[in-house]
């Protein structure tokens, strides 16, 4: 009935409303400078200030600049919206040691577990890696009898520890001296390591071997079944696939039932020391000479104890490979040595924090 329809031009003469033909109802007219948050606003709260691009409307109704993720060590987690800032987080392979509003003030590379130890929890954008001793032949989850009754989610398949050259384990986040603690937020819960329930609670002389599966009816496929992250080698042994979890490595080919995962140096790096299915030592490309730091009084001594070099002693480059090659089992404290006449020298101690410079190259942060 025509008389039931609002008078289109004035909505019963109310100047603060207008008639929207598309939705066939009266809508609230947003005051000058404010914009509707929906197609047909009904009340003043449905109107808002319009901010410039890359600005958002904060709780106090002010247009505030969205944070920028333009630093090399940051990536965008959530975009800039009308009512919320862009959120940045540390890029993969790094964690936030000093948080900032909607961003991170300082990102450090994840720690690399020292040779012989295993990853308990891999690093995330918020948390660093946590390592622990390996558990030879016995599930690490059985700390009390009740823990051995059923699989626990934190168990990592055990194999002989592979020496890892921590040439890039420049990421341990505790300065060697001075005791400067990183913000405690750099250490609450991490994501769990991959489960491997079938290795729990039973010692195994063949790490990574699952109980042999019965042959499927009419099938000749009766091969030995290995645990996740293990492969069947030529000798018919279950062998741990190499891990590409080091910050300077990326996965080239995945871990398959009959072949190991293969790793290669991440873009911008070249392999200085090769290793089976991986690279023991990646160096930035192009290579530039690195300064090294040693305590002068220790120069003549064999048993040098390393200290974090003072701020400003580390150039924006990584060490050159020593004569191009180094043994894959280089010990953590010696893996970064530069070929020189001096006694032990350590450009980037494994326990000095390493951040990224504005050029994206690792730089030492002495705390």
């Amino acid at each position: 009935f025509p008389q039931d329809r609002p008078f289109e031009d004035t909505c019963h003469g109310n100047p603060s409303h207008y008639y929207d033909k598309a939705v066939r109802r009266c809508c609230y007219r947003c005051p000058m400078g404010l914009f509707p948050t929906q197609q047909c606003p009904q009340r003043p709260t449905d109107c808002r200030k319009q901010c410039e691009p890359d600005y958002y409307l904060d709780e106090a109704d002010r247009c505030t600049a969205c944070v920028t993720c333009s630093r090399d060590d940051l990536v965008e987690k959530t975009p800039c919206a009308w009512n919320s800032s862009r959120v940045c987080e540390c890029r993969p392979g790094m964690f936030c040691s000093t948080s900032a509003v909607n961003s991170c003030a300082r990102c450090f590379f994840h720690s690399v577990c020292p040779a012989g130890m295993i990853v308990k929890f891999p690093g995330t954008a918020q948390k660093n890696t946590v390592c622990e001793p390996a558990s030879p032949g016995v599930s690490p989850a059985c700390a009390s009898p009740e823990n051995c009754k059923e699989p626990s989610s934190g168990t990592i398949p055990q194999a002989k520890p592979t020496p890892v050259s921590p040439a890039t384990s420049s990421a341990s986040t505790m300065p060697v001296r001075g005791g400067t603690r990183l913000a405690q937020e750099a250490a609450s819960k991490l994501t769990r390591a991959p489960d491997s329930p079938s290795s729990v609670g039973r010692p195994s002389s063949d790490p990574g071997l699952s109980p042999t599966q019965p042959c499927p009816e009419g099938s000749g496929d009766c091969r030995k079944q290995c645990e996740p992250d293990y492969y069947l080698d030529e000798a018919g042994r279950c062998t741990a696939c190499v891990s590409c979890s080091r910050d300077d490595l990326v996965e080239k080919t995945p871990c398959a039932w009959n072949s190991s995962r293969t790793c290669e140096c991440r873009p911008g790096m070249i392999c200085a020391t090769s290793a089976t299915n991986s690279c023991a030592r990646c160096v930035p490309y192009p290579i530039c000479a690195a300064e090294t730091v040693t305590k002068p009084q220790d120069m003549a001594e064999k048993d040098t104890t390393f200290e974090a070099p003072p701020l400003g002693t580390q150039p924006d480059c990584n060490p050159t490979p020593e004569n191009g090659e180094a043994p894959a089992s280089t010990s953590p404290t010696q893996s970064l040595l530069v070929d020189s006449q001096a006694s032990k020298t350590l450009p980037i101690p494994t326990s000095a924090p390493v951040a990224l410079s504005s050029t994206g190259k690792p730089v030492l942060d002495a705390g």
């Epitope: 720690s111 690399v112 577990c113 020292p114 040779a115 012989g116 130890m117 308990k120 929890f121 948390k127 660093n128 890696t129 946590v130 390592c131 622990e132 001793p133 390996a134 558990s135 030879p136 016995v138 690490p140 989850a141 700390a143 009390s144 823990n147 626990s152 934190g154 520890p161 020496p163 384990s169 341990s172 986040t173 505790m174 603690r181 990183l182 405690q184 750099a186 250490a187 609450s188 819960k189 991490l190 048993d303 040098t304 104890t305 390393f306 010990s331 953590p332 404290t333 494994t350 326990s351």
Partner: antibody, heavy 123, light 107 residues
């Protein structure tokens, strides 16, 4: 500052169950990477690691005592507990709880120790 | 279990001397070794971790070295307050194990 303090019964008879409590302050066991271990030391002898509890309630223990050991924690009250069943005179020792620090997350050593509580097992 | 052997139960020294305490692992533990100092009636205190890194606040006369199976703690200029027992610890694999200790005494 970080402090840890052990408490226990002092004296037990063989076959009884030992219950120890480690009360700590200055850190939280909810922080990732953090953990607390129990370590014992018979008088005039070396140190023996017994068990460890991680921030996420994951536990590890010494296989030589595993069947008798239970480690647990109460994060909100900043306490870690150790139970050893069927004690024997060989369990006579000073029992320490010690913290594995979170910020040395790629190492496994103990930066702060309690003063220890002495247990004597005697019939 | 990995056995950590500290062959010398006692070592005699004088103030100002340089002394080296040794520790041998029964198998390769890479550099996953810590050293502690324990004074009579006290609990152990960390000195060195990862075989050669000095723990925060530890005087620089304490140095650690070694990797694989042989480790050394060296005190370059022994002070009277250094007279204590020294323990090595491996954390390469569970169970974590300690050496039997070496007591540093005055000559």
């Amino acid at each position: 500052q970080v402090t840890l303090k052990e408490s226990g019964p002092g004296i037990l008879q063989p076959s009884q169950t030992l219950s120890l409590t480690c009360s700590f302050s200055g850190f939280s066991l909810s922080v990732s990477g953090m953990g607390v271990s129990w370590i014992r030391q018979p008088s005039g002898k070396g140190l023996e690691w017994l068990a460890h509890i991680h921030w996420d309630d994951d536990r590890r223990s010494n296989p030589s005592l595993r069947s008798r050991l239970t480690i647990s924690k109460d994060t909100s009250n900043n306490q870690v507990f150790l139970k050893i069943t069927s004690v024997d005179t060989a369990d006579t020792a000073t029992y320490y709880c010690a913290r594995r620090p979170d910020l040395y997350g790629n190492y496994f050593f103990f930066d702060f120790w309690g003063q220890g509580t002495t247990l004597t097992v005697s019939s | 279990d990995i056995v950590m052997t500290q062959s010398q139960k006692f070592m005699s020294t004088s103030v100002g001397d340089r002394v080296s305490v040794t520790c041998k692992a029964s198998q390769n533990v890479f550099t996953n070794v810590a050293w502690y100092q324990q004074k009579l009636g006290q609990s152990p205190k960390p000195l060195i971790y990862s075989a050669s890194y000095r723990y925060s606040g530890v005087p620089d006369r304490f140095t650690g070295s070694g990797s694989g199976t042989d480790f050394t703690l060296t005190i370059s200029d022994v002070q009277s307050e250094d007279l204590a027992e020294y323990f090595c610890q491996q954390y390469n694999s569970y169970p974590v194990t300690f050496g039997a200790g070496t007591k540093l005494e005055l000559k």
